[in-house]
Interface confidence: low
């Protein structure tokens, strides 16, 4: 019987992975080194696939080796000591001027030279750039660019505001109609804010004593209904408003004489006035019942050369009368006159005139109030420093509004280098038919009320206080104090502002740059104005445009519109 | 901490006025928003009106012929006035700083 | 006036349900919307205000949502001391009003 020979020579088993050979009867066995396996230990182990231990246990790359395998790490990355795990290079340490004069960011493999909003990274110089957006045609009117921004403007005095998209511009529109249907038989005595508004003469025979019977509305106080004077200015008579009662100055070679009388006529209500020259008096009547009867010597104006020539100014005189007058008038008037009947000669050739020209009509129906019609502006010259006020200077400030348009600048102040340290201003809000109330320094808004319904025929409330420490905003749902720390870089600008002159705007802005303040509209719409407990009448304003009425405020456009002789003045206010 | 205390008549007579008095104490009438409401029998709250801090008002039009509110900054106390009451008025009248804080409300019923 | 429409009128839940209070405005008010609880015998007390901000010392259980002019007051788990009546409030324009109230009670 042959010997069976050693199976294990010459050896069966793949050299590289096994680890022993065994020798059996006919037959061997490999025994494998980790790493291998087969019948031979033929076959390498790919370890990063094996289903037990996925990735072979790498936190990143798993490399296969022959009867092996290693861990390897990405880029920007190296691996920890036990020899599985990555951990990240944080190259902005390790080179610390890599990005120059841009901040370095460290992210995961890499690192990025970060760059402000508005900036752009230049590699050669390794350091940010502004980026022009105004270049690249970013705005549909007006763009300013900034460094690190730019902000679009459209030109709020023309009637537009910047679009929710902050580029585009679209019309402020109207959010509360109103009734502005005037009649060209009503005369609007406060077409001008400085000047007379009619002017008539009349030459009739000498036996014509003065006479003017006019229907009369309004709801100021004080100012000039009427001024008739004779050809050589030696005579003359006032018809005057004040303290809402009528007054009568008149002069003449024989006298000089004051009057007030009668009861209380600025109620927003037609109230018929007749002015009446008798032999020896002067008859005043309100509803046709003498208020007063003023004596006289002899006749009112002399008749030369047999007639008496007059001459008649409505809602005004000519300027070197003022210094005439017994007691001065500001002569400013807000109201209207219908039916009049001067000197009895009816009310024939006036209506001529007023027909054509459309500002000297009245509108059919007014309430209480001031109105700005979204072209022009209010000036005041206001004294804000209180020596009793440790603070030094305040800003209390009460707005009644009933807004018609919901963009618009309510109060600024400007001081003389064109800017504006403070603004009050309103803009639609995103939410639908509301608004918010915008306060502003400058060009910053400090403080914004949120979706508030304005819009409405009720008026609305708002009290601010300002001083150089804090801004307190009073609104019913409640009491907003923003501090000088929140606030003390724009309360600083505020308060350097106050220091010089300051003029204060009402219903908008004097020609100040469109970048000067985040609104630029005009306000429209009714509002009242309180400032440190002083009720701004815009008959005293240093300037007013003529289209401000100071002393009535249109309706809420109504389907079905009050006739002139209905006139229910009402006042819906948070007062 | 903010408190207040409703009083006044619980029984007022139809045509008369109705009179309320709010005490505050733990904060002063001179800032903030200082409220009227009211709780009819069938659970139906009403907004009535406001003083401010500065001592401006603002009524509910549904009431703003016959209401009144006034203050007393010296005794901190703020009041109310309802003018030619009816049965209707009978409710629970609260004072309210804002509406975070609220008296516990008074009952005021209105019969002849 | 904006009407603000509450409901259900009346609710009956067993402790450690959860619950759903609506309240529907005539009208859209922004996010302008205040929710009270008013216990028996007790003053109305704030939950949450403009429409979902939790108020100090009130339980996170109570949470609110909506926007516009549909609102929805819930309470995650009532307890017993959830019972009582629930208003909604408008501020959106004046005069602020309330709604009818939910009755929440003890089934």
């Known amino acids: 019987v042959n010997a069976i020979p050693d199976q294990c020579s010459p050896l069966p088993c793949n050299e590289d992975g096994y680890m022993s050979c065994k020798d059996g009867k006919a037959s061997f066995t490999c025994t494998c080194k980790p790493g291998w396996q087969g019948e031979k230990c033929e076959f390498d182990i790919n370890e990063c696939k094996d289903p037990s231990n996925i990735n072979g246990g790498c936190s990143q790359i798993c490399d296969n080796t022959p009867g092996s395998y290693h861990c390897s790490c990405k880029s920007g990355f190296v691996m920890l000591s036990n020899k599985k795990d990555c951990k990240d290079v944080d190259e902005c340490s390790l080179k610390p001027n890599m990005c120059g004069t841009a901040v370095c960011k460290n992210i995961p493999g890499d690192f990025e030279c970060e760059c402000p909003e508005g900036y752009r990274y230049n590699l050669k110089s390794k350091s940010c750039e502004d980026v022009d957006e105004c270049s690249e045609n970013m705005c549909a009117q007006l763009c300013v660019n900034y460094p690190g921004g730019y902000t679009c403007y459209c030109d709020g005095k023309k009637g537009f505001k910047l679009a929710q998209d902050q580029k585009s511009c679209e019309a402020v529109s109207v959010c509360l109609p109103l009734n502005l249907d005037t009649k060209y038989e009503l005369l609007y005595l406060a077409e001008q804010f400085a000047g007379v508004v009619l002017y008539l003469k009349f030459r009739l025979p000498e036996i014509s004593r003065f006479s003017a019977e006019f229907d009369f509305r309004t709801y100021d106080s004080q100012g000039v209904i009427l001024y008739a004077e004779s050809i050589d200015h030696s005579a003359w008579l006032l018809i005057a408003l004040r303290g809402g009662k009528i007054e009568v100055q008149l002069k003449n070679e024989h006298t000089s004489k004051i009057t007030t009388g009668g009861d209380i006529i600025n109620n927003g209500l037609w109230n018929m006035v007749s002015v009446e020259e008798l032999e020896h008096s002067i008859s005043i009547k309100i509803a046709k019942e003498a208020v007063m009867d003023i004596n006289k010597p002899g006749p009112l104006f002399k008749p030369e050369n047999g007639l008496l020539e007059t001459k008649v100014y409505f809602a005004g005189f000519p300027r070197k009368v003022e210094s005439e007058l017994i007691k001065p008038i500001n002569p400013r008037l807000d109201g209207c006159i219908r039916s009049w009947n001067l000197m009895k000669q009816g009310a024939s050739g006036i209506k001529e005139i007023i027909q054509e020209k459309q500002n000297k009509h009245c509108l059919v129906t007014v309430e209480k109030g001031s109105y700005y019609p979204g072209s022009g502006i209010a000036e005041f010259h206001i004294d804000y420093n209180n020596g009793s006020n440790a603070e030094g200077w305040h800003i209390n400030v009460t707005l009644n509004i009933r807004p018609s348009m919901g963009t618009g600048v309510m109060l600024a102040l400007v001081s003389s280098n064109n800017t504006v340290p403070f603004a009050v201003s309103l803009v639609d809000s995103t939410s639908e038919k509301s608004q918010d109330i915008v306060i502003s320094v400058e060009n910053t808004v400090i403080y914004r009320i949120q979706a508030l319904s304005l819009c409405s025929n009720q008026r609305s409330h708002l009290e601010f206080r300002v001083n150089r420490n804090n801004l307190e905003l009073l609104t019913p749902l409640k009491i907003e104090t923003i501090s000088q720390e929140e606030l003390q870089t724009q309360l600083a600008i505020l308060d350097k502002a106050m220091k010089g002159k300051v003029a204060t705007y009402l219903g908008g802005l004097p020609d100040v740059p469109f970048s000067a303040t985040p609104v630029n509209a005009f306000y429209n719409g009714c509002m009242e104005v309180n400032i440190n407990g002083v009720e701004l009448d815009l008959d005293e304003a240093i300037s007013k445009h003529n289209d401000i009425r100071a002393h009535s405020c249109p309706s809420v456009w109504k389907k079905t519109k009050n006739s002139e002789d209905q006139v229910d003045p009402r006042l819906i206010d948070g007062k | 901490e903010v408190q207040l205390q409703e009083s006044g008549p619980s029984l007022v007579k139809p045509s008369q006025t109705l009179s309320l008095t709010c005490s505050v104490t733990?904060?002063?009438?001179?800032?903030?928003?200082w409220n009227w409401i009211r709780k009819f029998p069938g659970n139906k709250l009403e907004y009535m009106g406001y003083?401010?801090?500065?001592?401006?008002?603002y009524y509910n039009p549904s009431l703003k012929s016959r209401i009144s509110i006034t203050r007393d900054t010296s005794k901190n106390q703020y009041y109310l006035q309802l003018n030619s009451v009816t049965t209707e008025d009978t409710a629970t009248y609260y004072c309210?700083?804002?509406?975070?804080?609220w008296g516990q409300g008074t009952l005021v019923t209105v019969s002849a | 006036d904006i009407v603000l429409t509450q409901s259900p009128a009346t609710l009956s839940v067993t402790p450690g349900d959860s619950v759903s209070l609506s309240c529907r405005a005539s009208?859209?008010?922004?996010?302008?919307l205040h929710w009270y609880q008013q216990k028996s015998h007790e003053s109305p007390r704030l939950l949450i205000k403009?429409?979902?901000q939790s108020i100090s010392g009130i339980p996170s259980r109570f949470s609110g949502s909506g926007s516009g002019t549909d609102f929805t007051l819930s309470i995650n788990s009532v307890e017993t001391e959830d019972f009582g009546m629930y208003f909604c409030?408008?501020?959106?324009?004046?005069?602020?009003?309330f709604g009818g109230g939910t009755k929440l009670e003890i089934k």
């Open positions: 003083i401010s801090f500065s001592g401006s008002t």
């Open positions: 733990g904060d002063s009438i001179t800032s903030g928003y």
């Open positions: 409030q408008q501020s959106n324009s004046w005069p602020w009003t």
């Open positions: 403009f429409v979902s």
């Open positions: 309210a700083r804002e509406f975070a804080y």
């Open positions: 009208q859209s008010i922004s996010n302008n």
